[in-house]
Amino acid sequence: VDSGNDVTDIADDGCPKPPEIAHGYVEHSVRYQCKNYYKLRTEGDGVYTLNDKKQWINKAVGDKLPECEADDGCPKPPEIAHGYVEHSVRYQCKNYYKLRTEGDGVYTLNNEKQWINKAVGDKLPECEAVCGKPKNPANPVQRILGGHLDAKGSFPWQAKMVSHHNLTTGATLINEQWLLTTAKNLFLNHSENATAKDIAPTLTLYVGKKQLVEIEKVVLHPNYSQVDIGLIKLKQKVSVNERVMPICLPSKDYAEVGRVGYVSGWGRNANFKFTDHLKYVMLPVADQDQCIRHYEGSTVPEKKTPKSPVGVQPILNEHTFCAGMSKYQEDTCYGDAGSAFAVHDLEEDTWYATGILSFDKSCAVAEYGVYVKVTSIQDWVQKTIAEN
């Protein structure tokens, strides 16, 4: 704006004139600065002083003005005729994490210098752990009793839990901070009236390649005598990688008769010793009525009688399914409880925890292992995680 005033008068931006000093004078200078997310590109320092000819001059570059460039080191995009450059960024996640947002992850700078997404406004996305995508899926085996070694880290959701009496059991990572296991595992060597607070400090938990993780708390299913399930919360989120990755929780019921699942475990092997290496077996989902007849003699309530070949009765109800020992004599055994019955959804190329092994006493003597259906506990799991 040409105000007609001399430049030594009050500047047009409303700044007061600086006070005079004895034997001195006021030199008019400006410092160029850039808006948020931009940086000054100049060989000088960005400070320009008014010379006698009323030109703004920088000591190093003379009257050559600086430029503002994007602060990520990107060159300034070329201008186009009748158009303009709109500044936008796309959020992406590191390996083994995926973007959680209702938008598309693209944010544009608005007039108020806010990064805005069309769908979600200024709400930023989050990076959540990828689940059910092992880098090296398990090889199919026709032979965790006999079982096969998991040499490739095909079950990155498998955790090893050790009780204070040194008994090994399983647990299953379902997100960065929570694991599923059985209530029975949590109560191992504890009296029935032990509380969740009593139990948590007595457990040692390992994920991945025997990486020790600290437990913050355990939460037992409100009906754990019938639904043999508990949740473990870690003090810190685990870092997800090739060796440590949660398994997905299913929205569909994959426990269809005949479907094959993979069960990994640290439990006892054919010699009845705890295995030093994670092993796995492939087992088909069994017909529920046959399983009930095998353990209880009949599907008719009044005709039921305990007849477990291993002397211990499993919990069998609408929240459970059975998986059959195959003709190859593979089976789960003591210490495998808490491990997932992992099913590969080929349409999504994703692995889901269809069940959590509850009855692990079959050991190739009884016909079936018994699993808690994850679809039966899904609501409780989500509610518990949200509340904690």
Epitope: P137, N139, P140, Q142, K252, D253, Y254, E256, G258, R259, V260, M282, V343, H344, D345, L346, E347, E348, D349, Y352
Partner: antibody, heavy 121, light 107 residues
Framework: EVQLLESGGGLVQPGGSLKLSCVAS????????MSWVRQAPGKGLEWVST????????FYADSVRGRFTISRDNSNNMLFLQIDSLRAEDTAVYYC??????????????WGQGALVTVSS | DIQMTQSPSSLSASVGDRVAITCRAS??????LAWYQQKPGKVPKLLIY???ILQSGVPSRFSGSGSGTDFTLTISSLQPEDVATYYC?????????FGGGTKVEIK
């Protein structure tokens, strides 16, 4: 008992069109990938097309891509195959088939009785 | 696309014989292979899936083996009712190609 029933077959001239339908019953139709498989007279089985259970992913054999269109109507338990630009080599019995398990593409444990499509002038 | 090659295309054997049919995938398909039996004038019937899991109700004389690229269907003791054409099919992901078929007859 699961049932799949095809209809819509018949005699068509080369270059003509036809729409095959398959009505399914006694299972949760929307949970399963569904396919069309054909068998020319005296020949082997040929996979034609598949429609995924989740979303709307469709897949076609090279021999039919661009001429055949698979679709499904989950609310009415129906699978369709729109066949255009028919050729003599499309003459076959067309079977509707159900994937055995949720989340599986194939290993069909139930098949329809088949619909005969004859392409001839 | 992965090709499925079945051999032999036909065979003739006596009742009680052990019969083997092979199926080769041009690339690895892990264990995602199914075997079907089709009798003349009938629809195909699923025999084996996941390479070696016997479908419910299928006689135990049928068995499957293999993983990756090479698979075998074995009939341990051929019966007259086994006269049919047998097909393999890859089931990992589309295209869900079938093998060319093996016609089994009784001598």
């Amino acid at each position: 008992e699961v049932q799949l029933l095809e209809s819509g077959g018949g005699l068509v001239q080369p270059g003509g069109s036809l729409k095959l339908s398959c009505v399914a019953s006694e299972f949760t139709f929307s949970n399963y990938a569904m396919s069309w498989v054909r068998q020319a007279p005296g020949k082997g089985l040929e996979w034609v097309s598949t429609f995924s259970s989740g979303g709307s992913r469709t897949f076609y054999a090279d021999s039919v891509r661009g001429r055949f269109t698979i679709s499904r109507d989950n609310s009415n338990n129906m699978l369709f195959l729109q066949i255009d630009s028919l050729r003599a080599e499309d003459t076959a019995v067309y079977y509707c088939a159900k994937a055995q398990f949720v989340g599986h593409w194939a290993q069909y444990n139930y098949w329809g009785q088949g619909a005969l499509v004859t392409v001839s002038s | 696309d992965i090709q499925m090659t079945q051999s032999p295309s036909s065979l003739s054997a006596s009742v009680g014989d052990r019969v083997a049919i092979t199926c080769r995938a041009s690339q690895g398909i892990r264990n995602y292979l199914a075997w079907y039996q089709q009798k003349p004038g009938k629809v195909p019937k699923l025999l084996i899936y996941d390479a070696f899991i016997l479908q419910s109700g299928v006689p135990s004389r049928f068995s499957g083996s293999g993983s990756g690229t090479d698979f075998t269907l074995t009939i341990s003791s051929l019966q007259p009712e086994d006269v049919a054409t047998y097909y393999c099919q890859k089931s990992d992901s589309p295209p869900l190609t079938f093998g060319g078929g093996t016609k089994v007859e009784i001598k």
